[in-house]
Interface confidence: low
C-alpha cells in the first residue's frame, strides 16, 4: 500500500530519452512501479521500471529509440503515468501531460579537450551530445574551473550566451593543475533546466620560463 504525497518530475533530452524521478513520502512495501509513456500523436508507447535512488525516490529512463533519433517534436505531448502494482492490477499513482520541449534537460557535453595551453591561458573545446537539430543555435553554456584548494561550489560560473563550443580561460597561474566542467541549456522551454555537468577535464598550465616575470 502507498500513502503520502508524491512528486513526479521528468525531462526530455531533446532526442530519444525521457528521464523521470518519482518521490513518495509514504513507504512502498516491496511494490513494483513503472513509468508508462503514451504519446498522443505517435505510433509507439514505452515503459520503464522505477528503481530506487534513495529512501523515498525512484528513477528510470524511457528509451524511445536510437540515441540520435528525433522521437518527439515541439507539438508532441506525452501522457506519463506512474503505475504501481497492487495485487493483480496496476494503480495509477501519478499522472502528467508532459510537453517534451517545455521540459528539456540535455545530456552533459562530451569530448572535452585542451586545444591549446600556455602559462596563463588555456583554450578548451567540447561537443554537445544528442541535442535536437530544432535548437539550431539557440543554446547557452555555463562553465567552471576548479582551482587548487577550492571546491566546485566555490568556482565562479562563466556564462556563454550563445552556441559556442569552446572557451579561452585567462589569468591562470603557471604550472598549476586545474579541472574544467561545462553544461548546456536550450533557450526553449518553460521548465527547461541545465544539463548535468560534463565529466571534469584535468589540465595543467605550462611553467613560466626561467627568468621571466610570472
Amino acid at each position: 500500500a502507498v500513502n503520502g504525497t508524491s512528486q513526479f518530475t521528468c525531462f526530455y533530452n531533446s532526442r530519444a530519452n525521457i528521464s523521470c524521478v518519482w518521490s513518495q513520502d509514504g513507504a512502498l512495501q516491496d511494490t513494483s512501479c513503472q513509468v508508462h509513456a503514451w504519446p498522443d500523436r505517435r505510433r509507439w508507447n514505452q515503459t520503464c521500471e522505477l528503481l530506487p535512488v534513495s529512501q523515498a525516490s525512484w528513477a528510470c529512463n524511457l528509451i524511445l529509440g536510437a540515441p540520435d533519433s528525433q522521437k518527439l517534436t515541439t507539438v508532441d505531448i506525452v501522457t506519463l503515468r506512474v503505475l504501481c502494482r497492487e495485487g493483480v492490477r496496476w494503480r495509477v499513482m501519478a499522472i502528467q501531460d508532459f510537453k517534451p520541449f517545455e521540459n528539456l534537460r540535455l545530456m552533459a557535453p562530451i569530448s572535452l579537450q585542451v586545444v591549446h595551453v600556455e602559462t596563463h591561458r588555456c583554450n578548451i573545446s567540447w561537443e554537445i551530445s544528442q541535442a535536437s537539430h530544432y535548437f539550431e543555435r539557440h543554446l547557452e553554456f555555463e562553465a567552471r574551473t576548479l582551482s587548487p584548494g577550492h571546491t566546485w561550489e566555490e568556482a565562479p560560473l562563466l556564462t556563454l550566451k550563445q552556441k559556442q563550443e569552446w572557451i579561452c580561460l585567462e589569468t591562470l597561474t603557471p604550472d598549476t593543475q586545474y579541472e574544467f566542467q561545462v553544461r548546456v541549456k536550450p533557450l526553449q522551454g518553460e521548465f527547461t533546466t541545465w544539463s548535468p555537468w560534463s565529466q571534469p577535464l584535468a589540465f595543467r598550465t605550462k611553467p613560466a620560463a626561467l627568468g621571466k616575470d610570472t
Epitope: 498522443d40 500523436r41 509507439w44 508507447n45 517534436t73 507539438v75 502528467q96 501531460d97 510537453k99
Partner: antibody, heavy 119, light 106 residues
C-alpha cells in the same frame, strides 16, 4: 465506433458567450485528445485549441484571451467556451480527434454545429 | 504562425485526369496532412504523415514532399472527388490549414 457529437450552437448576440459540448462515444476522453476547429461560411478551416487526455490545454494564441476548453470525464464530454463574440466568429464549430491516439491527423470529426453571431 | 499557401485555389478537370495540388509552408514543417471536404460535410482525413493513406481512402490519392513544399495528387479523378481539399501542418502551434483548393469536373 468512434463518434463525436457537438451541440450548443445557435444564434448569439455580439459580445455574448458561447458554450458548446462535444459528446464522445467509442472512446474515452481520458485516453485521447480532443481538438476544436471552426469554419466560417465559405471560408477555410481554423484550428482553435485542444484539450489533452490528462486535462491540459493548448490554444491558438489569437483566441487565448477569450477561449476555454474543459471536459467532464464522467460524462465523456468536452466543452468549448468562447467569450466576447463578434460577427466574424460566425462559423461551423467542429470537435475532432486524432487517429488511433498514436498517429496524427484529424481522423474523426463531429458533424459540426453552426454558431451565428448577430443582433 | 506558419502560413500554408495552396495552389491553385480552384481547378476544373475531366474524369480520369491526374490532378495535382501544391501546398507551400512559410517555414519548414515536419508533418503534412490532407483533407477532403464535400459541401455541407465535415472534413475527411485522406493523407497523414505526408504520404500515408488514411484508413479506407482509395489508392488514387497520394501525398509527397518535405520542408516547405508538399504535393497532393489524385491519379485519376472520379466524379465523387468533387470537393475542397485542404493541407494542414502539425509541426508548430497553432496548427494551420491551407486556404483550400476547390476541385470541379469539366
Amino acid at each position: 465506433e468512434v463518434q463525436l457529437l457537438e451541440s450548443g450552437g445557435g444564434l448569439v448576440q455580439p459580445g455574448g458567450s458561447l458554450r458548446l459540448s462535444c459528446a464522445a462515444s467509442g472512446f474515452t476522453v481520458t485516453s485521447y485528445a480532443v481538438h476544436w476547429v471552426r469554419q466560417a461560411p465559405g471560408k477555410g478551416l481554423e484550428w482553435l485549441g485542444v484539450i489533452w487526455s490528462g486535462g491540459s490545454t493548448d490554444y491558438n494564441a489569437a483566441f487565448i484571451s477569450r477561449l476555454t476548453i474543459s471536459k467532464d470525464n464522467s460524462k465523456n464530454t468536452v466543452y468549448f467556451q468562447m467569450n466576447s463574440l463578434r460577427a466574424e466568429d460566425t462559423a461551423v464549430y467542429y470537435c475532432a480527434r486524432a487517429g488511433d491516439a498514436n498517429y496524427d491527423g484529424f481522423a474523426y470529426w463531429g458533424q459540426g454545429t453552426l454558431v451565428t453571431v448577430s443582433s | 504562425d506558419i502560413q500554408m499557401t495552396q495552389s491553385p485555389s480552384s481547378l476544373s478537370a475531366s474524369v480520369g485526369d491526374r490532378v495535382t495540388i501544391t501546398c507551400q509552408a512559410s517555414s519548414s514543417v515536419s508533418f503534412m496532412y490532407w483533407y477532403q471536404q464535400r459541401p455541407g460535410k465535415a472534413p475527411r482525413l485522406l493523407i497523414y504523415d505526408t504520404s500515408n493513406l488514411a484508413s479506407g481512402v482509395p489508392s488514387r490519392f497520394s501525398g509527397s514532399g518535405s520542408g516547405t513544399s508538399y504535393t497532393f495528387t489524385i491519379s485519376s479523378l472520379q466524379p465523387e472527388d468533387i470537393a475542397t481539399y485542404y493541407c494542414q501542418q502539425w509541426s508548430t502551434y497553432p496548427l494551420t490549414f491551407g486556404q483550400g483548393t476547390k476541385v470541379e469536373i469539366k
